[in-house]
Interface confidence: low
């Protein structure tokens, strides 16, 4: 969905730094926040 508050987070690597390494994401909806915000400790 669209709208909603924006969240900045670091989308950390998942396992052994294999994937999505240190990518800054601005997630654009609560739904995307749930879908892509993998690590609360990565929040900014």
């Amino acid at each position: 969905g669209g709208g909603g508050s924006k969240h900045k987070c670091v989308q950390n690597s998942l396992v052994n730094n294999e994937t999505l390494e240190s990518i800054m994401n601005t997630l654009e909806s609560e739904e995307d926040f749930r879908k892509y915000f993998y690590y609360l400790e990565g929040s900014k």
Epitope: G2, L14, V15, T26, E28, R34, Y38, E41
Partner: antibody, heavy 114, light 113 residues
Framework: QVQLVQSGAEVKKPGASVKVSCKAS????????VSWVRQAPGQGLEWMGW????????NYAQKLQGRVTMTTDTSTSTAYMELTSLRSDDTAVYYC???????WGQGTLVTVSS | DIQMTQSPDSLAVSLGERATINCKSS????????????LAWYQQKPGQPPKLLIY???TRESGVPDRFSGSGSGTDFTLTISSLQAEDVAVYYC?????????FGQGTKVEIK
Amino acid sequence: QVQLVQSGAEVKKPGASVKVSCKASGYTFTSYGVSWVRQAPGQGLEWMGWISAYNGNTNYAQKLQGRVTMTTDTSTSTAYMELTSLRSDDTAVYYCARNWGDYWGQGTLVTVSS
Amino acid sequence: DIQMTQSPDSLAVSLGERATINCKSSQSVLYSSNNKNYLAWYQQKPGQPPKLLIYWASTRESGVPDRFSGSGSGTDFTLTISSLQAEDVAVYYCQQYYSTPWTFGQGTKVEIK
């Protein structure tokens, strides 16, 4: 609404290259990555790789390493997938998808035939 | 690489009946730090791209009917269609996005009996 619109079908000779485009709209392009997935006729889904639209980082499937290149143009919110040294078994529908697959393009049929 | 194996390869179910598809990963896709399973389910109809149904193994994508549900954790997962409708005829795929290469199951074809 989120949309991924891909370029049209291609027919290529063995040994040639193909470059498929995927134009994104409805979201902030640089906030997400783009995956490329292909599907040979009557077969399942094969993940080809992923590119970050934020910083251009790529992660390619090992079997395609050296033949595939994924790029983005942030000025036009477009992702590209180029596959070189085409073989008949590269004949497939090629899909782009946002990140690991919440939104998908309509697919691009690439036929490799002599 | 993580291998994903679905069963059965195909199934025929009467309208209104339950359809169950299983997916097994060759290693766990549960990340202990956030207790999330990096597992998605897709539906693909002929001539169309896959459509996301379920992510995090059990979270339904917005707009997906509630007859679709996902369950399981670690290495064993299930997609259930509680009451099969004619429009549910399709091929269903599971996918892990725990580690690259992100891999798909071979697909399960669901038909009407």
